[in-house]
Interface confidence: low
């Protein structure tokens, strides 16, 4: 009977290991063998691995490489979801202290309007957030409607509110004289333009936001393919089919083997960094009528003001709408009676402002600023990975698939392996489907960032005027662009302290006849829309 | 291994104040919403404030409405109830809570502290 | 408020017998409902959430079921240690609020 092998030749150390990845032993030899059932640890002499345990391996391997793309983009993606849903929130809340102002607006400057107001007010509203969140609402058919809407309950209830019963059933004549008429001049025009701008940008970027996420979802649970399981195996594991269980990859070696894997993923880099590039120039125009927070919570001035301007002119449309709607069949003539001398006030619109301490656009910037530290984020990736996972500094003593080295060559790394996979057949293949998708989505978001971004696009154009909105805005007739101070009204000031104070607590229209006053107010608000929960929101 | 100290509950005055603290450790702090909810004498269980991972958002039920305030400082891992203007109803065992991180079920729950208000 | 009835404060039962707690929500609050066990001196722990997924670390005697509004805890057999109360939430609005719980005796 022969002696017993001496300790170094047991795969005692090997057992012990593997037995961590796998619980149970019967799939280590005891003793080394030939392994001629091996396919990726071709050995060199004895090893102590089976053909089981290297496709143990195989797993383990791709499974870890999942895991490290996914520790690698965890801070981009908390980054980019974290603010996608603190932008739709806010969102969200910018609309709902719209929609109260507006409401408050009615309640205490024309009561006799509510309820029939709030309900029009809370439909155009709804309308708002639904159009953010990618609803394919036309933004001047929601103007029109909400003005079209007002115009039958303001010309009953403000300039003609001795009307009998009988002459109540003119509600459509009136819709179609109020644009006929221009009935609010060009409010509902100048409304159109700096909600659409605003929305248009607003929404935009909250695609953006989430097709981020979908980019870093896609990339974070990409499957590795066998090619680049074995791959990572070799340069993994199969050191320790040797018994040599301290030893650490090479960084070139890594660096290779990363880049092969990652070759498809690679590939989105450059959309990758033009979607932030672009994603910045949309948020350097978010500002005035291209800033949502500051053009939806001016509105209820604005709404204010286009009322005044009908009371103004109350005495003659009140006679041509009298003429014009006294029987439902003269609606075609409507054109004949319009009013050439309606009176005009030279007020001029003040969109909104707020106060810049925490508003959303800082917050904006800020995320910006953050996501441009991420821009050689995906040409970083395979560095990222050899530096976060085990490797030998300066390639002193080290694995390099094969055997121990002194110095990583990729050559003699090459020719050593002509039995073996091939590391270069990894970079010839194209990219996955799945990331050929993701790349489509990212060139087309790029696409309609930089139509929003281009100044010739004239969607964020930066030469505003003083007042906050492009000359010509307004039409030919400068002297319909008004506004004013809203007289009686409320200052906004300070809107939102964004993420201090939330949701309006009152909603008006919910409660038309609560004693609270709906007015803005510049005090801490206290509503918690939805923790997290995706069942229902806040009511 | 995820743990919730309150502290700072007591005897108080009707009409006094109080703030709770509720130390957080074991976990990324900053990734959860937290809540306090409070165990009234008859064993009720009642929602009294929630705040989001980054505390710029806060839920307030009507009972406390405006005498109550959560906070958070994530550089601290801690959460705070400031209550003020106490009522004998607020007499109750108060819980630090945080939520599950894909729900809003309540997922861990501190020991809690007690605060009892007296005439 | 959604209200949560818990209708049955007290049940009496025995050692590896099956337990039904049900809990029924005044409106639809879909499957966002979560089940809690309290011990005496200790605080509610979570067993269940959306009405039917179970928490990790525990037992699978626990079972939760329902949507809508009536929503069912099951203990499949009843060990001692589960001799205590069990309090129901919804969670689909605010305020979030739960059920005056259901106190588990024995026979």
């Known amino acids: 009977q022969p002696p017993p092998p001496p300790p170094d030749a047991t795969c005692h150390q090997v057992r012990s290991f593997f037995q961590r990845l796998q619980p149970g032993l019967k799939w280590v030899p005891e003793t080394p063998v030939p392994g001629s059932d091996l396919q990726v640890c071709l050995p060199k002499g004895p090893t102590c691995c089976s053909r089981k345990m290297e496709e143990k391996y195989q797993l383990t391997a791709r499974l870890n490489m999942e895991q490290l793309l996914q520790s690698a983009s965890m801070e981009l993606k908390f980054l980019i979801i974290q603010n996608a849903a603190v932008f739709q929130e806010a969102f969200e809340i910018v609309v709902r202290h719209a929609k109260n102002y507006t409401n408050a607006m009615f309640k205490n400057n024309y009561p006799s309007l509510t309820p029939q107001a709030f309900e029009f007010v809370g439909e155009f509203f709804t309308d708002v957030s639904l159009y953010i969140l990618g609803s394919d609402i036309n933004v001047d058919d929601m103007v029109n409607e909400l003005f079209d809407s007002l115009f039958p309950v303001i010309y009953t209830q403000l300039m003609n509110p001795g009307l009998p019963d009988s002459a109540l059933d003119i509600n459509e004549c009136l819709r179609g004289a109020r644009r006929d008429l221009k009935v609010f001049g060009n409010f509902p025009k100048l409304i159109m333009t700096q909600v659409s701008k605003s929305l248009q940008v607003t929404r935009i970027f909250l695609q953006a936001l989430n097709l981020g996420i979908e980019v870093i979802n896609t990339t974070d649970h990409l499957k590795f393919s066998k090619d680049c399981g074995r791959m990572l195996t070799r340069m993994w594991y199969c050191s320790y089919c040797q018994g040599l269980m301290m030893v650490k990859p090479c960084g070139g070696y890594c660096n290779v083997v990363m880049q092969g894997c990652m070759a498809g993923v690679v590939e989105i880099d450059k959309y990758w960094r033009e979607y932030i590039l672009s994603l910045e120039e949309l948020v350097n125009g978010m500002y005035r009528i291209y800033d949502m927070e500051n053009v939806l919570l001016g509105l209820f001035s604005t709404i204010h003001d286009s009322i005044q301007y009908v009371q103004k002119n109350a005495g003659k449309l009140t006679t041509t709408i009298g003429k014009l709607c006294a029987h439902s069949q003269q609606r075609q003539y409507r054109s004949a009676y319009y009013p050439e001398d309606l009176f005009i006030d030279k007020k001029v619109l003040k969109v909104a402002h707020v106060e810049h301490e925490e508003t959303l656009s800082s917050r904006r910037r800020e995320l910006i600023q953050k996501l441009k530290s991420f821009i050689s984020f995906y040409s970083a990736l395979p560095g990222y990975i050899c530096s976060h996972s085990p490797v030998a500094e300066n390639d002193t003593l080290c694995w390099n698939g094969q055997e121990l080295v002194e110095r990583y060559s990729q050559k003699a790394a090459r020719n050593g392996m002509k039995n073996q996979f091939n590391l270069h057949e990894l970079k010839m293949k194209g990219p996955e489907p799945v990331v050929s998708q993701i790349i489509d989505k990212l060139k087309h978001i790029n696409q309609l960032l930089r139509t929003m971004s281009m100044p010739k696009g004239r969607v964020l154009d930066k030469n505003l005027d003083e007042e906050g909105f492009e000359s010509g805005d307004c039409g030919d007739d400068e002297d319909e662009c008004i506004g004013g101070s809203g007289d009686g009204m409320i200052k906004v000031k300070n809107q939102l302290r964004f993420l201090a104070e939330l949701a309006y607590d009152l909603d008006v229209d919910d409660a038309p006849g609560n004693s609270q006053q709906a007015t803005p107010k510049d005090n801490e608000i206290s509503t918690f829309h939805n923790l997290g929960n995706v069942h229902s929101p806040l009511k | 291994d995820v743990k919730l100290v309150e502290s700072g509950g007591g005897l108080v005055k009707l009409g006094g104040s109080l703030k709770l603290s509720c130390a957080a450790s074991g976990f990324t702090f900053s990734s959860y919403y937290m809540s306090w909810v409070r165990q009234t004498p008859e064993k009720r269980l009642d929602l009294v404030a929630a705040i989001n991972f980054y505390g710029g958002l806060a839920y307030y039920p009507d009972t406390v409405k405006g005498r109550f305030t959560i906070s958070r400082d994530n550089a601290k891992n801690t959460l705070y109830l400031q209550m003020n203007s106490l009522k004998s109803e607020d007499t109750a065992l108060y819980y630090c809570v945080r939520h599950y991180r894909y729900d809003n079920a309540m997922d861990y729950w501190g020991q809690g502290t007690s605060v009892t208000v007296s005439s | 408020d959604i209200v949560m009835t818990q209708s049955q404060k007290f049940m009496s039962t025995s050692i590896r017998d099956r337990v039904n707690i049900t809990c029924k929500a005044s409106?639809?609050?879909?499957?966002?409902v979560a089940w809690y066990q309290q011990r005496p001196g200790q605080s509610p722990k979570l067993l269940i959430y959306s009405a039917s997924n179970r928490y990790s670390g525990v037992p699978d005697r626990f079972t939760g079921s329902g949507s809508g509004t009536d929503f069912t805890l099951t203990i499949s057999n009843m060990q001692s240690e589960d001799l205590t109360s069990y309090f129901c939430?919804?969670?689909?609005?605010?305020?979030?609020?739960f059920g005056v719980g259901t106190k588990l005796e024995l026979k």
């Open positions: 939430q919804q969670y689909s609005s605010y305020p979030l609020t």
């Open positions: 409106q639809n609050v879909g499957t966002a």
